[in-house]
Interface confidence: medium
Amino acid sequence: IWSAVFLNSLFNQEVQIPLTESYCGPCPKNWICYKNNCYQFFDESKNWYESQASCMSQNASLLKVYSKEDQDLLKLVKSYHWMGLVHIPTNGSWQWEDGSILSPNLLTIIEMQKGDCALYASSFKGYIENCSTPNTYICMQRTV
Amino acid sequence: IWSAVFLNSLFNQEVQIPLTESYCGPCPKNWICYKNNCYQFFDESKNWYESQASCMSQNASLLKVYSKEDQDLLKLVKSYHWMGLVHIPTNGSWQWEDGSILSPNLLTIIEMQKGDCALYASSFKGYIENCSTPNTYICMQRTV
């Protein structure tokens, strides 16, 4: 959080920013910033692999849900969107793109279809879907 | 947009931030920042007047929809939430808290109930509702 004092000295001018206010980011231009994570919702429908590649091309990854508190904005998201959660058949676990295992009680996993990829839906639900099915998707970039 | 060069001189250290990235805000702590507007979704149900007072107490106002482009994050919002749109019986117009008139084609107004207040619903819909009915609400703060 940058205080008004710091900003005043920075710009050598009067900028009255309450101490309870802060800048968020940095994020790619026109992305949503929340609790220093960056999110973007993409309208075009792509399969999971193409969605992943699209996020990669923007130096981001598909949505990773890691905290109901830090990501409570997600509870109000309408519709279904690819996230970075995949089923690893060899060990039966659900894991994120970065290799971390899905924490218990974070998502309610619902078998909508046979598949190894998951769609995010409101109120922290994950719908299993065939990875080849086109859907909209959410990219996420964690700031340092 | 603050370039990496500026940030380097600011902090006198290596901060590689692409020129296409930017900080958003300032916003109240833990609010959503998007295209330099600040939003917060409140879970507790209040009537329109209490919702307005709650936003005011945080130096904000109830949601004002002014641009489908600049506020396209709103199309994905689930459920119904009070916004700052009210019906003025004397002239029959819908106007925002700041007195500005609702621009044509911004919202599809749907008469859900008899009333003079409006709930925001996804895809830029406004549902007419009795102002005394408790609902969740969205506060908004426009940054300078």
Epitope: Y49, E50, Q52, A53, M56, S57, V86, I88, D98, G99 | -
Partner: antibody
Framework: QLQLQESGPGLVKPSETLSLTCTVS??????????WVWIRQPPGKGLEWIGN???????YYNPSFKSRVIISVDTSKSQFSLKLNSVTAADTAVYYC???????????????WGQGTTVTVSS | DIQLTPSPSFLSASVGDRVTITCRAS??????LAWYQQKPGKAPKLLIS???TLQSGVPSRFSGSGSGTEFTLTISSLQPEDFATYYC?????????FGQGTKVEIK
């Protein structure tokens, strides 16, 4: 086992278009998780990623080539192609077509390579 | 773009030596780093990816370590067939980038 073979002219004149084709044999070119890649190596220098194409046709290009590169796929011929226009002497290189290793839904490098084809840009 | 800086650029060593090559990324790339070996006139060969996982058929004298921005390729006992150029590559985000390479020569 999967094999890749580049083909195309070895000599291209400056300002013209470099066109290369990669033929995939010993396996399918299309599938829900099939990506293909072009990489080049100028003489005596390092490797440079040009771009990827997904079997459905989605492409991802290196921004340093973006305005003049087109990668396409023809699943019926089991081929994918590279076109690089407005070439200069700096585009002289060995061009490789390749397949990234996609395992557990993430790229783990490039594990299948063509033998490479040398393209010289000269008048 | 994510830059990869290998060190050293050149390395003279003898058969049996332990050789270590490092690759530094300009930003954190988790474990999304691959190591390749390339011999003159040949296509590169994938040795290790992600970061520390040896690809099948690659001798166990090769090993990789690291995460984030600092990565290491180690050859525990250099063999005659290991004299080559070694490249690192990041696959965390597009554009995929390679380091400029480390040439391992016979001393």
């Amino acid at each position: 086992q999967l094999q890749l073979q580049e083909s195309g002219p070895g000599l291209v004149k400056p300002s013209e278009t470099l066109s290369l084709t990669c033929t995939v044999s010993g396996g399918s070119i299309s599938g829900s998780s099939y990506y293909w890649v072009w990489i080049r190596q100028p003489p005596g220098k390092g490797l440079e990623w040009i771009g990827n194409i997904y079997s459905s046709g989605s492409t991802y290009y290196n921004p340093s080539f973006k305005s003049r590169v087109i990668i396409s796929v023809d699943t019926s011929k089991s081929q994918f192609s590279l076109k690089l226009n407005s070439v200069t002497a700096a585009d002289t290189a060995v061009y490789y077509c390749a397949k990234p290793l996609l395992r557990d839904y993430y790229f783990y490098g490039v594990d299948v390579w063509g033998q490479g084809t040398t393209v010289t840009v000269s008048s | 773009d994510i830059q990869l800086t290998p060190s050293p650029s050149f390395l003279s060593a003898s058969v049996g030596d332990r050789v270590t090559i490092t690759c530094r990324a300009s930003q954190a790339i988790s474990s999304y780093l691959a190591w390749y070996q390339q011999k003159p006139g040949k296509a590169p060969k994938l040795l290790i990816s992600p970061a520390s996982t040896l690809q099948s058929g690659v001798p166990s004298r090769f090993s990789g370590s690291g995460s984030g921005t600092e990565f290491t390729l180690t050859i525990s006992s250099l063999q005659p067939e290991d004299f080559a150029t070694y490249y690192c590559q990041q696959l965390k985000s597009y554009p995929w980038t390679f380091g400029q390479g480390t040439k391992v020569e016979i001393k």
